[in-house]
Each structure stands twice: as C-alpha cells, then as structure tokens.
Interface confidence: medium
C-alpha cells in the first residue's frame, strides 16, 4: 500500500546530515551497484515449462526509463512431449521495484518515488479447484 | 543520462537529463492500486518448482527486510508429487531498487541501490553437456 502522510521524524540527527525540507527526502540517483549483472541460468524463459516473452517499456519521465516486463506464453504448462497441458497453469511471478517519476507542472519540475509492478517470469502451478456447492 | 521532453515555453536553464540528486516527496506512490493483480502468496507452495523464503535484514535500507526465494529441490515436482531430477528448479532473479541511507543514520537522505533478488523458481529442461 501507499506509504502515507509525513509525521513525526525521530532520528538522532547527526550534524553532518544534509538539510532537507519537511515532507521530502534527498535522493541520490547515482545507483550503487549500477553495473551488477543478473547471472540467471541461460535462456530460462524458453526452457521453462511455463515459458515467457519479454517486452521493454520505455518512459522518458521515469528513472530508470527502461523496465522489462515478462508475459507468460501459455495458459497451461509445457509437458515432456512439448505440448501444452491445460490441467496445470502458467502464472506470472510479480515483483515491485522503485522508480523515480519526474512530473512537469507548468515550468516547474517535481520528483516522486513510485512503486511499479514488474512481471519477472512465470512458474507452473497446480490450479486451485473451486467446487460449486 | 536520460533525456526528458520539456515544455518549449520554459526557460532553457533546465537540464534535459535527470539530475544526480533530487528532492522527492516522502510519500511513495503506488501505481499498482486497483489496476494490477494483487499479490498471490501461495504460488511458492503450488509451483512444480516450489520455494521457501529466507530473511535478510539491514536497518539502513528500505525495505529493511528482504525475503529471498530459495528453490526447495534441484528437480521439479511431477504429477505424482515426487521430485523428478530430469528437470531442474531454477531461481528467477531480478534487480530491484532499494533506498540506502547515505550518509548512514541520516533521517531523510538516501541513495538508490540496485539489489539482485530471487523472486521465485521455475521448472526448466536441463542443458545437457555431452562429453566428447
């Protein structure tokens, strides 16, 4: 859920802390570990029993501007014969990430932290069966 | 940097790229509300490549606790509920951005940090290496 209204700040404030206006935070967007790379097993998106495709979304007013989204290729899962088994379900694994949103209000610019939901990949699950009374 | 489209009527002093340091509102906006599927917490158990969640805590980071997925088995669960070692459970990893207090202990000064997390597991056909 959304982090709500600004209230009482209670930290023991070291003298070296930068001054910050009330209700806001100073954010350095030079990312720590910027060059770290994901070392996932090779092309798991194609080898998975719940395979997926990737699409890249681009928004110049967002930092980072590029966010990659996965989409499950099938409703069912791929069996040992390479056929879709609809008795099982391919489901998206979703995760939030933080981004910085740049907003233009007239000629002034403001920045907002935002949580964005990203689909990371898919997994194969046994379906939940609802029995009708 | 990232180029930003700008209102052509505004003074030209503004940088087109994101500045290195910005002041942001303490409220974190949630774009997901009512538009996306809600968190589904039981896939970890129902998956053919099930996983457990393990805790990693750092009080100078937001979020302070990160739960990492660890695949329960090397193989995948077959239709009989047994582990099939002809298939592999592998983690799905993703980079997320977190907030790191910088300088440490300062209440409202942060830096973005990229962290690699395992979010869940998926079942894949193994890569078979044939020895010559």
């Amino acid at each position: 859920r959304k982090i709500p209204k600004v209230g009482h700040t209670f930290f023991q404030k070291p003298e070296s802390c930068p001054p910050v206006p009330g209700g806001s935070m100073k954010l350095d967007i030079g990312i720590i570990n910027e060059n770290q790379r994901v070392s996932m097993s090779r092309n798991i998106e194609s080898r998975s029993t719940s395979p997926w495709n990737y699409t890249v979304t681009w928004d110049p007013n967002r930092y980072p501007s590029e966010v990659v989204q996965a989409q499950c290729r099938n409703l069912g899962c791929i069996n040992a014969q390479g056929k879709e088994d609809i008795s099982m379900n391919s489901v998206p694994i979703q995760q939030e990430t933080l981004v910085v949103r740049r907003k233009h209000q007239g000629c002034s610019v403001s920045f907002q932290l935002e949580k964005v939901l990203v689909t990371v990949g898919c997994t194969c699950v046994t379906p939940v069966i609802h029995h009708v009374q | 940097g990232i180029t930003i489209p700008r209102n052509p009527g505004c003074p030209n002093s503004e940088d087109k790229n994101f500045p290195r340091t910005v002041m942001v509102n303490l409220n974190i906006h949630n774009r997901n509300t009512n538009t996306n599927p809600k968190r589904s917490s039981d896939y970890y158990n129902r998956s053919t490549s099930p996983w457990n969640l393990h805790r990693n805590e750092d009080p100078e980071r937001y979020p302070s606790v990160i739960w990492e997925a660890k695949c329960r088995h090397l193989g995948c669960i077959n239709a009989d509920g047994n582990v099939d070692y002809h298939m592999n459970s592998v983690p799905i990893q993703q980079e997320i951005l977190v907030l790191r207090r910088e300088p440490p202990h300062c209440p409202n000064s942060f830096r973005l940090e990229k962290i690699l997390v395992s979010v869940g597991c998926t079942c894949v056909t193994p890569i078979v290496h044939h020895v010559a």
Partner: antibody, heavy 126, light 107 residues
Framework: EVQLVQSGAEVKKPGESVKISCKAS????????ISWVRQAPGQGLEWMGG????????DYAQKFQGRVTITADESTTTAYMELSGLTSDDTAVYYC???????????????????WGQGTTVTVSS | EIVLTQSPDFQSVTPKEKVTITCRAS??????LHWYQQKPDQSPKLLIK???HSISGVPSRFSGSGSGTDFTLTINGLEAEDAATYYC?????????FGQGTKVDIK
Amino acid sequence: EVQLVQSGAEVKKPGESVKISCKASGGSFRSYGISWVRQAPGQGLEWMGGITHFFGITDYAQKFQGRVTITADESTTTAYMELSGLTSDDTAVYYCAREPNDFWNGYYDTHDFDSWGQGTTVTVSS
Amino acid sequence: EIVLTQSPDFQSVTPKEKVTITCRASQNIGSELHWYQQKPDQSPKLLIKYASHSISGVPSRFSGSGSGTDFTLTINGLEAEDAATYYCHQSDTLPHTFGQGTKVDIK
C-alpha cells in the same frame, strides 16, 4: 525475538488525555513500524494508526484523526500513542503491535502484526 | 473502508474435531489477509499471514486458504488449548480492519 512492553494501566476523567508507551527490544527498531490497536470491553479489535519508522511518518484511522498522535524515539526504542478528548467510549485495552518493513514475496511492504505488547487498560470515568 | 465479516460468530467444538472459520471481505484484497488468535486476558497472536503462510512456532494444525474476497482458517484436530477468539485482519487498504471475531470453545 522482538518484545514489546507497554506502560501500566491508566484511569482518566472525561476530556483528559492519555499517553501510552511501548518499549521495543530485540531486532532493529528501524526495521519495522508500530501500529496501535484498541479493544473495548467484550468487543473486537480496532486499528487506530501507526508509524513507519524508516521514514518517520504516521497515518491514522479517520475516526481518530485529530485526537490521536503517534510518535517514536529511536534513542530509547520506544513508541508512544497519545489520545486526547477522552470519553467513556475510549475505555479499552490499548495494544501496540509490530508491523514489519519487508520486501516479501516480491512486494515492498508487509502489514501483518507479528508481535504484540501486553496491552494497557485505560479507564475513562468521571 | 473494507468490511470483514466472519462466520460463525461462535462455535462449540469437540476435541480432535475439524474447525473451519470463514472471513469475507467487502472487496478484493488479494491475499492481504491475516489471522490472529486471542485467548482471554491475553494479547492477540499471529497465526497465519498473507492468507496461507504459516508462522514459525504455530502448530501445523492451523492452516489458511483463499484469496480475493473469501478466506478460510482451518484447525485440523482441535485441542483444548485452542479455545480462543479468532480474528481476520486485512492490510490491503488503509485503514486496517478486523473481522468481528469468532469465539471457539470446547464442548
């Protein structure tokens, strides 16, 4: 294991204020928030508001807005809840509860109450 | 605000019996639903988080299921020490809200 220890019982007159403390030990105080939940005699649980320690921000249930103030002091790892303008309807047991600040199962915030104080009985009577 | 309605309000059960308590939300809350146990003159205790996640130290006879608007807490093989009031709690939307409670006693 996080432990939350609350201040003792209070007897107040209508119109007065009460301030209850909740001292946390074990775990990092910054790694979670504290919510306040009350329970009137023979009734269910009612959330009043909470503080998210990491950003030092608060939010309150509409019903208590303007009457409740939640604060925290990191140096003593203690959270406080002050309720003003007391009436007999505020007679209840008041609990503090820990709210984890987690990235859990792919999401940034979790909001279960995984540890509770022992409760503070507040009696409002003229 | 989101209203949680539990049923039944009261249940009298024989030891070793299976107990099922349901909680219905007035709108979709995904799996942001938690269950607590409260014994007389004690604080509530977390039993299940996020609809189905078990909590370490809680006996395995307690389990949870459901998503969206309909949730269930199941006690498989009730024991005498399980006599308590059980509450569901949603954290999807502020304000946090609780069900009215289900009192379980032993026959």
